[in-house]
């Protein structure tokens, strides 16, 4: 314990903040999902679709994507992965089209989340199998990945 | 770097703490929702639907509602969207009643959340265009708005 | 205000974090859900099927649950529950198996969120009823009950 | 600079269905969002709907039941069908760009291109 | 989807100011600021004058202005000039996604 030494207590706060948000490309062409650079990044970098994590510690990550699927003649199911240092950490799967009816369109919203652990040098990444069914085109804003620190390594 | 510098550590600290969590209110009449102002509120004031920023910083804002649906003979688009000073910032969708059959009743949750920079006086809302789906008889206290300053402004 | 007293803004610096990232246990058997106890645990204790808080606070708690249906001939109406001293403090529903169809499988996901304060030896829980349907085989990993401290109690 | 210019037959039958084509030039379709809009002579304007690059729609929901908005990026070109027309749906109709996304917003502009109209009369 | 309510007509003399209102509702005009403003000559497509409530497309006079309080937007012209004679529609976002027009106002310069 060092209540009274204000140096000690300093460099064992947990001041340090890092968090990204970012939305996904525009055109998507293979299972793991790309997003745009313009988004927010503080202290972490986005390199061929990943997150790279600067500084180690306790994250919290969230994605959420928006689906628009047009129904064939069975259901659909959509999953969406995340991936930590490629290696499935975590996923969320719904069904959708259930009723085997062809339907103009369904809207369907998927989230997941992750609290981890990451080294420097991790790296973050969304894997969805049904891609295709991402609404770039109605929603395109809809569908981000999201991180923040919540803790540092003492 | 002030690394040894305590005052200086401190000044660009990220201690300050802003929060909220609203609850819907019981009766609502109009798209855009109006939330008890009985919840918790923490360095954010509550007025006339919105809710109004007085700390600038990076915010986790998350919402959401529990819909409940008398299905009619075609499906229905349950849409969410948050508002940043009454502009559409992100929104989700969900399409339910997708059999086209009348059923009973069904049941369908949908969140949506958004991290972002927010300046003194913004103001955060929520649409939702099928207001009157909105569950607020048999589970009332499951539809919320919340944010959290996750880092206030250097 | 004490902004130029070092010690009087650490006594009041929001330093203290707990967090909690637990996974559902393999075999469940009633309504009530259990956690593996080898997750994340950190200024939070696990007990029969509770976290238990030890320091008090504003918490952000978050559950996510993977569903797997094997649908009769009606619907199901999944519901998760959030339980602060064993009073229900927020659930979230969802239909599926909507057309009545038998069909092989259906996926599921339902999250719910809170932000609440809690006491020291407040206990957080999480209740379904439909147990049976939660996918421990094929996604046991997907089934998280997670928590943060966002603000210590000054 | 983006043009657009409506093509379609000037008379249709009543109970028939009207189909028009509006054709963009100097822009990718796929880029944008794209509206119909019509106006009796001597009234206002009424939207009639909106289509995405993906093909999904958004329809105004008093003319839900009868309209079909499609889009064929191949020819950068989209589509307007209006079943059982009355003397009622006698009007100019125009194709409009509608609002865009751009950078992390959306950006609700209005429409901010328009074609010059094609007049349509319903008459046996 | 009702239309947004507009006065039928105004005037105004060269070199004065003149204000046409738009009343919405809670579910379009009132809930975004997404509302636009069109001037339509006769025999002729509407041009797009105004857009965000306030918002002047590139090559439009900022004799042209737009606010809105509540329920209601305006748009207002300034320093009135013959070639302003037209009609005005205002249009508004509504929480269907859809769009919907006003009844339009004739400005007659006089």
């Known amino acids: 314990d060092c209540s009274e030494d204000l140096l000690c207590i300093l460099k064992r706060a947990p001041f340090k903040k890092s968090w990204a948000y970012l939305q996904v490309a525009k055109h998507l062409d293979k299972t793991k999902l790309s997003w745009n650079k313009d988004g927010i990044l503080h202290g972490v970098r986005y390199q061929d679709g990943n997150l790279v994590i600067q500084f180690p510690g306790l994250y919290f990550i969230i994605c959420q994507l928006q689906f628009l699927v047009q129904c064939p003649n069975n259901s659909v199911d959509l999953k969406l992965e995340l991936l930590i240092n490629k290696h499935i950490k975590k996923q969320a799967l719904v069904t959708v089209c259930e009723s085997g009816m062809q339907t103009k369109h369904v809207y369907q919203n998927l989230s997941q989340f992750l609290l981890d652990y990451l080294q420097v040098n991790t790296t973050i990444s969304v894997n969805v199998d049904t891609f295709q069914y991402i609404d770039t085109s109605t929603f395109p804003l809809e569908n981000v990945l999201s991180i923040f620190l919540y803790s540092n390594s003492d | 770097d002030c690394s040894e510098d305590l005052l200086c550590i401190l000044k660009r600290a990220p201690f300050k703490k802003s929060w909220a969590y609203l609850q819907v209110a019981k009766h609502l009449d109009k798209t855009k929702l109006s939330w008890n102002k009985d919840g918790i509120l923490h360095g954010v004031r509550y007025q006339d639907g919105n809710l109004v920023i007085q700390f600038p910083g990076l915010y986790f804002i998350i919402c959401q509602l529990q819909f409940l649906v008398q299905c009619p003979n075609n499906s229905v688009d349950l849409k969410l969207e948050l508002l940043i000073n009454k502009h559409i910032k992100k929104q989700a969708l969900v399409t339910v009643c997708e059999s086209g059959m009348q059923t009973k009743h069904v049941y369908q949750n949908l969140s949506q959340f958004l991290l972002d920079y927010l300046q003194v006086n913004t103001t955060i809302s929520v649409n939702v265009d099928t207001f009157q789906y909105i569950d607020t008889s048999t589970f009332p206290l499951e539809n919320v708005l919340s944010i959290f300053l996750y880092s206030n402004s250097d | 205000d004490c902004s130029e007293d070092l010690l009087c803004i650490l006594k009041r610096a929001p330093f203290k974090k707990s967090w909690a990232y637990l996974q559902v246990a393999k075999h469940l058997d009633k309504t009530k859900l259990s956690w593996n106890k080898d997750g994340i645990l950190h200024g939070v204790r696990y007990q029969d099927g509770n976290l238990v808080i030890q320091f008090p606070g504003l918490y952000f708690i978050i559950c996510q649950l993977q569903f797997l249906v094997q649908c009769p001939n009606n619907s199901v109406d999944l519901k998760l529950e959030l339980l602060i001293n064993k009073h229900i403090k927020k659930q979230a529903l969802v239909t599926v198996c909507e057309s009545g169809m038998q069909t092989k499988h259906v996926y599921q996901n339902l999250s719910q969120f809170l932000l609440d304060y809690l006491q020291v030896n407040t206990t957080i829980s999480v209740n379904v009823d439909t147990f049976q349907y939660i996918d421990t085989s094929t996604f046991p990993l997907e089934n998280v009950l997670s928590i943060f401290l966002y603000s210590n109690s000054d | 600079q983006v043009q657009l210019q409506e093509s379609g037959p000037g008379l249709v039958k009543p109970s028939e269905t009207l189909s028009l084509t509006c054709t963009v030039s100097g822009g990718s379709i796929s880029s944008y969002i794209w509206s119909w809009i019509r106006q009796p002579a001597g009234k206002g304007l009424e939207w009639i709907g909106r289509?995405?690059?993906?093909?999904?729609?958004n329809y105004n929901p008093s003319l839900k039941s009868r309209v079909t908005i499609s889009v064929d990026t191949s020819k950068n070109q989209f589509s307007l069908k209006l079943s059982s027309m009355t003397a009622a749906d006698t009007a100019v109709y125009y194709c409009?760009?509608?609002?865009?996304?751009?950078?992390?917003?959306?950006?609700?502009?209005?429409?901010?291109?328009w074609g010059q109209g094609t007049t349509v009369t319903v008459s046996s | 989807q009702s239309a947004l309510t507009q006065p039928a007509s105004v005037s105004g003399s060269p070199g004065q100011s003149i204000t046409i209102s738009c009343t919405g509702t809670s579910s379009d005009v009132g809930v975004y600021d997404y509302v636009s403003w069109y001037q339509q000559h006769p025999g002729k497509a509407p041009k797009l004058m105004i857009y965000?409530?306030?918002n002047r497309p590139s090559g439009v006079s900022n004799r042209f202005s737009g606010s809105k309080s509540g329920n209601t937007a305006s748009l207002t012209i300034s320093g009135l000039q013959t070639e302003d004679e037209a009609d005005y529609y205002c249009?508004?976002?509504?929480?269907?996604?859809?769009?919907?027009f006003g009844g339009g106002t004739k400005l007659t310069v006089l």
């Open positions: 965000e409530v306030s």
């Open positions: 409009a760009r509608d609002y865009r996304v751009a950078g992390t917003y959306y950006y609700y502009y209005g429409l901010d291109v």
């Open positions: 289509i995405y690059a993906s093909g999904n729609t």
């Open positions: 249009s508004s976002y509504t929480s269907r996604s859809t769009w919907v």
